[in-house]
């Protein structure tokens, strides 16, 4: 692309945080080998991505965990991936759901989530998942992610 | 994009090959429904994508994997993307991780990883596995690209 | 990329709907959170995504399934993306394979495909899978799309 | 800010063994890599060997690969290169570094001299 000024490249990419705070929406960091291209997509409150432009966005995010069986909830861990547009309702763009593993202590799973989405000037999507607690956090297994088409 | 002579597309998708070494690197080939859009992006020695520009790439691989718990070692299989700079360390840039199917005589599973990435001049891009004997090479069933945003 | 009229963005995501046809093709549908950017690229009865122009596509699909290991089939459950272009036969560009759960009534999986691949004018591409039965279509769980690099 | 300094190096003989310590003072994190380059006399500094400091993969030149072992203690802040079977064209001042990711390779140290000889 090597867009010009008027059309820059908008791309982001964060890094997983682990966090002691109870809500089920993820926490990332711009650490590692993270992408921040511009002021033009910023991480807010380590929680969410939010644009300043409106247009086409490649959205994704990608969470591994390590759950069990026996110590989960019946239901399947569920990772979802949802937008917070000014002045609208919350909404669920993408979910993926696995079923927890049987093995012992627990079993690590991935799974990956993304597509194109249309995004409003000061659109914000971030990742909710069923239990924090059993997101992976070592190099590479978690992360979140957008690019402006 | 369709872009001009100075800002040409760079993309490339390959298809996995089955190696008799014993290496944890992937092998890939041009072959079958495979893209590589230019010079400006080559596959070196069937196992990394090297990029002659610098600039923010969307880098992906899907690996598929066969494996029995008991019949496997106790930790899960994991897939990595890789990236070797000059200068630099080789890094992790994205992990998956499954735990090993109790199914028998061996569990299919498939692993997503995708993201964002600045790339130097002369940086490849290469996807390592626990147990490459593990993979699935079946049409489709594992592959890897890369695309310059 | 904001693209001028010569080379406008073209995109799609479609959201998954529930069948009654016994076809393995999975049906897709215009709403919710859908995204079709212009003519210049349709759902055709509501299977598949046909482009109008020629060039690289990052190509992309999210299946969420249900199923249980002795309720099913031994095969695995299988997502193929496939290509029919015009006077070419149909071809099979990725697949994703995951083994059934033993958790019930079923256990919840979800596969995400994606690559990129050059199409030709008039090319459809689909989706495929071994048992359309067991495909989620919650908010969210099963998708499909493209753009064009 | 993160200060790296590396201890270990020495004089010894062929077939014998040394092992670096690289102690950091400050925060590694989780998602950086650590490593060792080194330099021999009138040649370019080049890669040795270096570890990913969550231990999610080490990696190796060819030309030390099973004879030279790296590894991290996070307790404590520091990397370790153990060398063995160690040979005349191993002399070289050895140098630890913090690949910070996007920030690149963003910390050194100061080198120590391996010197392999009878």
């Known amino acids: 692309m090597q867009k010009g000024d008027q059309n820059p490249q908008i791309a982001a990419h964060v890094i997983s945080e682990a966090s002691s705070k109870t809500t089920s929406v993820l926490q990332w960091a711009e650490k590692g080998y993270y992408t921040m291209s511009n002021n033009l997509v910023t991480l807010e409150n380590g929680k969410q991505l939010t644009v300043k432009r409106q247009g086409l966005y490649y959205i994704y995010a990608q969470v591994t965990f390590c759950s069990n069986r026996e110590a989960s909830s019946q239901a399947p861990f569920i990772a979802s991936l949802c937008l917070k547009s000014p002045g609208r309702f919350e909404r669920i763009l993408l979910r993926a759901a696995n079923t927890h593993s049987s093995a012992k202590p627990c079993g690590q799973q991935s799974i990956h989530l993304g597509g194109v989405f249309e995004l409003q000037p000061g659109a914000s999507v971030f990742v909710n998942v069923t239990d924090p607690s059993q997101v992976s956090h070592g190099t590479g297994f978690t992360s979140f992610g957008l690019l402006k088409l | 994009m369709q872009k001009g002579d100075q800002n040409p597309q760079i993309a490339a998708h390959v298809i996995s090959e089955a190696s008799s070494k014993t290496t944890s690197v992937l092998q890939w080939a041009e072959k079958g429904y495979y893209t590589m859009s230019n010079n400006l992006v080559t596959l070196e020695n069937g196992k990394q994508l090297t990029v002659k520009r610098q600039g923010l790439y969307y880098i992906y691989a899907q690996v598929t994997f066969c494996s029995n718990r008991e019949a496997s070692s106790q930790a899960p299989f994991i897939a990595s993307l890789c990236l070797k700079s000059p200068g630099r360390f080789e890094r992790i840039l994205l992990r998956a991780a499954n735990t090993h199917s109790s199914a028998k005589p061996c569990g299919q599973q498939s692993i997503h990883l995708g993201g964002v990435f600045e790339l130097q001049p002369g940086a490849s891009v290469f996807v390592n596995v626990t147990d490459p004997s593990q993979v699935s090479h079946g049409t489709g069933f594992t592959s890897f690209g890369l695309l310059k945003l | 990329m904001q693209k001028g009229d010569q080379n406008p963005q073209i995109a799609a995501h479609v959201i998954s709907e529930a069948s009654s046809k016994t076809t393995s093709v999975l049906q897709w549908a215009e709403k919710g959170y859908y995204t079709m950017s212009n003519n210049l690229v349709t759902l055709e009865n509501g299977k598949q995504l046909t482009v109008k122009r020629q060039g690289l596509y990052y190509i992309y699909a999210q299946v969420t399934f249900c199923s249980n290991r002795e309720a099913s089939s031994q095969a695995p459950f299988i997502a193929s993306l496939c290509l029919k272009s015009p006077g070419r036969f149909e071809r099979i560009l990725l697949r994703a394979a995951n083994t059934h759960s033993s958790a019930k009534p079923c256990g919840q999986q979800s596969i995400h495909l994606g690559g990129v691949f050059e199409l030709q004018p008039g090319a459809s591409v689909f989706v495929n899978v071994t048992d359309p039965s067991q495909v989620s279509h919650g908010t969210g769980f099963t998708s499909f799309g493209l753009l064009k690099l | 800010e993160v200060q790296l300094v590396e201890s270990g190096g020495g004089l010894v003989q062929p077939g014998g063994s040394l092992r670096l310590s690289c102690a950091a003072s400050g925060n590694i994190f989780i998602n950086n890599a650590m490593g060792w380059f080194r330099q021999a006399p009138g040649k370019e500094r080049e890669f040795v060997a270096s570890i990913e400091w969550d231990g999610g993969g080490a990696y190796y030149a060819d030309s030390v690969k099973g004879r030279f072992t790296i590894s991290a203690d996070n307790s404590k802040n520091t990397a370790y290169l153990q060398m063995n079977s160690l040979k005349p064209e191993d002399t070289a001042v050895y140098y630890c570094?913090?690949?910070?990711?996007?920030?690149?390779?963003?910390?050194w140290g100061q080198g120590t001299l391996v010197t392999v000889s009878s």
């Open positions: 570094a913090r690949d910070g990711g996007t920030y690149g390779m963003d910390v």
